[in-house]
Every structure is written in C-alpha cells, then in structure tokens.
C-alpha cells in the first residue's frame, strides 16, 4: 500500500496536454510484466542480495505523440515507462513473455525513473497557425531503487537528484523490450 | 485561469518544522510537474524540490533529508514538510507549475521566518 | 550542475534598448541547457517573459526577445518602459533534467 501513496494514485487515463504519459492502469496487472504466478520466490532465495546494482526492472517502451491545446506533434515520441517489481539481474528474462518475474518478500525495491532526456519536437498546429516548438522531458532509462519507509510508513523518502544522474562504473542492465513497441496516446503530463 | 495560493508560511524556531500548502486551480493538477522555489529576503531565486506528475521527488543539495514535497492529486494541493529549519532557510516559498522545463505559473508566495 | 551569471545591475532611458547577459559555466563549459527568463517586481512572484531561450508566452510584449550564443544566453529589451523596471533572472535545468538553476539576478533600473 506504501507504493500506491508513493504513486499518488495519478492512474487516470485521459486525454491532457503536454509532456508525460501516465503509466497506463493495466500495467498494474500486465501479463508482460512476467510477475510470478505463485506470488514470488520461496523464502532463502539463493540469489536474494542487498546489493541495488545487482537487480533489474521492466523499461516498457511506449509511442505517443505530444499535444498542446489544439496542436500536435508531427512525430510521436518514445519513452520508457518504468514499472513492476525489480528482481536480481541474472533472474531476469531477455525477451518479454518468457519465464518468472521474481518478487522480494523483503526489501522494498521498485523500477523508478534512472536518467531523463529532453527532446525538441515540432508540433503542428490546425487553421493555418505557425508550428510551435516545444522541449519535452520524457524518461530514458529506469533503474531499481531500493525504498526506505518513514516512521509513519504512510510515505517513502525520495530519490534526490542523484537518482537520475547516470552513474559511472555501473554495470548495463538488461532490458526487456517488447517485440515491437507499444503505441498508444497516453494521457500526456507536462 | 491557472491559480496557485500557497499557506503556512510563518515564524519559527531554528530546528523547527513547518508544513507549506500550495492550491492549485484552474488546470489538470495530476498531469503537471510541480516545484517549491524559494527568495530570501533581498537575495535571488532558488530552486528547492520538485515534484513529478507521478510523485517522484528531487532536492536541492541544500534542503535534501530536511525537507519533503508531496502532493495530493485528489485536493490539487502540493506540499513542503519543512524540518530541522536553519537561518538561512528564511525566505518566501514559491511553488511553480513545470511544464515544459519552465515555471509558466507562479503563486505570491508565503514567508518562512526562522528565528529564536 | 551548471551554474549562472548575470550582470549585477543594467540601467536605460525610456525609449532605449537593453541587453541582459546570462552566462553558463560547468564542468563541461559548452552549449547551455534552453534558458527561461522571469521578471520580478518588487513584493510580486516571478513572471515568466522567455522560454526556450527565445518564445514568449501569450501576453508577453514583443518588446522582450531572447538569444544565445555558445554558453550565453541573452534577454533585450527594446523600446524600454517605465514598467520595465524590476529585477530579471535566467534559469536552467540541470543535467538530469530534475533539478533548476537560477542567475543571480539583474536589477534593470529605467533612468
């Protein structure tokens, strides 16, 4: 439940303007996302670690395009939408659809934003109206974060700044990508 | 009409805690970035924390495990728990809507006077 | 993380066009992040007047434009006004894209 207040629940999908996709809700439950059926791994995992840069998560690859008002993208953009649980690396499948997602029964890890990008796009505008460009932010890598609790447990320290620098030494994850990437118009977010 | 009203600015005593409020109006809260940007008193702008639309957080160096944003997509309200407050934390707090890697909005501020 | 600097104070008589210079520098002295320019008057909040180093939101007057060159970002003010007086900050984001800085600020006095 600690995650849901994290997330603020912002899962609504509807059409917006500006820069960022909500997660869409399905991904909550998506088959592609390989969690275990069983609800996780046994307890005294041989590969459970306390060390974050030994586990992976999910990059989902999504295409929209970017509105503001009336005006759209001539282009859709890719990003990545972090989500799913983060299991240790050498668990983790190469392809989407194959094999067990692996669960934590203990530590609190979840696939975060890693690294943003910024984007220049052209967007288009109806009645004749001159093309408007706008620099997008849009996500580029995610990484595994592990997630400390407050007292209270009703909310989860931050990331800080250094959570999406790109860390030099650190060894590349494995990403899972969908056979071909998802399109779809998700609610934009600035 | 894009609104922000912030509140909960007020006197308090070095290593004490304050809560700020931040109303928004007027747009679709839960699809913006959203920042707390602070002045102090006769000094420039700087940057404190903002907020993602999905509720990831990023600090300043300054206020990083003194200070924690938040927000509330159900009463389009964003926050700033203000803790082991300092001196120098004196100013008037800003929050701003992010879009578009720039501050379009801007509410009037509310003064935070740390003091004994 | 890039840090800014802006001429303390630039004054000009009403009629007259003023440049405000915004420099980068940062570890790696190049092309700045897209720079925002905000005006401040004296008790208000900030207004955003440039974005994207050169677009002005509706209702800016077309008397404010911006440009930058290398590490320089710059804000003109042409035909300059009474009203123009204030103070103006350039700002930036930060490599992550998570973070902002801003110049120190410059005071524009109109003579």
């Known amino acids: 439940q600690g995650w849901q207040a994290f997330k603020n629940d912002a899962t609504e999908i509807i059409p917006e303007l500006g820069e960022y996709p909500e997660p869409p809700p399905e991904l909550e439950n998506n088959k592609t996302m390989n969690r275990a059926e069983n609800g996780g791994r046994p307890p005294h995992h041989p590969f459970e670690t306390k060390d974050v840069s030994e586990y992976s998560c999910r990059e989902l690859h999504f295409t929209r395009y970017v509105t503001d008002g009336p005006c759209r993208s001539a282009k859709p953009v890719t990003e990545l939408v972090c989500s799913g649980q983060c299991g240790p690396a050498r668990l983790l499948p190469n392809a989407i659809g194959r094999g067990k997602w692996w669960r934590p029964s203990g530590p609190d890890f979840r696939c975060i934003p890693d690294r943003y990008r910024a984007q220049r796009v052209q967007l288009l505008c109806p009645g004749g109206e001159a093309p408007r460009a706008r620099k997008v932010r849009l996500v580029a890598s995610c990484k595994c974060k592990r997630l400390t609790r407050f007292h209270n447990q009703s909310e989860l320290k931050d990331f800080g700044t250094e959570a999406a620098r790109p860390q030099k030494g650190r060894k590349p994850r494995p990403r899972a990508r969908s056979a071909k990437a998802n399109q779809a118009e998700l609610e934009n977010a600035y | 009409q894009v609104q922000l009203v912030e509140s909960g600015g007020g006197l308090v005593q070095p290593g004490g805690s304050l809560r700020l409020s931040c109303a928004a109006s007027?747009?679709?809260?839960?699809?913006?970035?959203l920042s707390w940007v602070r002045q102090a008193p006769g000094k420039g702008l700087e940057w404190v924390s903002v907020?993602?639309?999905?509720?990831?957080?990023y600090y300043a160096d300054s206020v990083k495990g003194r200070f924690t944003i938040s927000r509330d997509n159900s009463k389009n309200t964003l926050y700033l728990q203000m803790n082991s407050l300092r001196a120098e934390d004196t100013a008037v707090y800003y929050c701003?809507?992010?879009?578009?890697?720039?501050?379009?909005?801007w509410g009037q501020g509310t003064l935070v006077t740390v003091s004994s | 993380d890039i840090a800014l600097t802006q001429p303390a104070s630039v004054s000009g008589s009403p009629g007259q066009s003023i440049t405000i210079s915004c420099t980068g520098t940062?570890?790696?002295?190049?092309?700045?992040?897209?720079v925002s320019w905000y005006q401040q008057h004296p008790g208000k909040a900030p207004k955003l007047m440039i974005y994207?180093?050169?677009n002005r939101p509706s209702g800016v007057s077309n008397r404010f434009s911006g440009s930058k060159s290398g590490n320089t970002a710059s804000l003109t003010i042409s035909g300059l006004q009474a009203e123009d007086e204030a103070d103006y900050y350039c700002?930036?984001?930060?490599?992550?894209?998570?973070?902002?800085?801003f110049g120190g600020g410059t005071k524009l006095t109109v003579l």
């Open positions: 701003a809507r992010d879009t578009y890697l720039h501050f379009d909005y």
């Open positions: 007027g747009f679709t809260f839960r699809s913006h970035w």
């Open positions: 907020t993602t639309h999905q509720g990831y957080t």
């Open positions: 940062s570890s790696d002295v190049g092309d700045i992040n897209d």
């Open positions: 994207d180093v050169n």
């Open positions: 700002s930036s984001y930060g490599e992550s894209l998570t973070s902002y800085v």
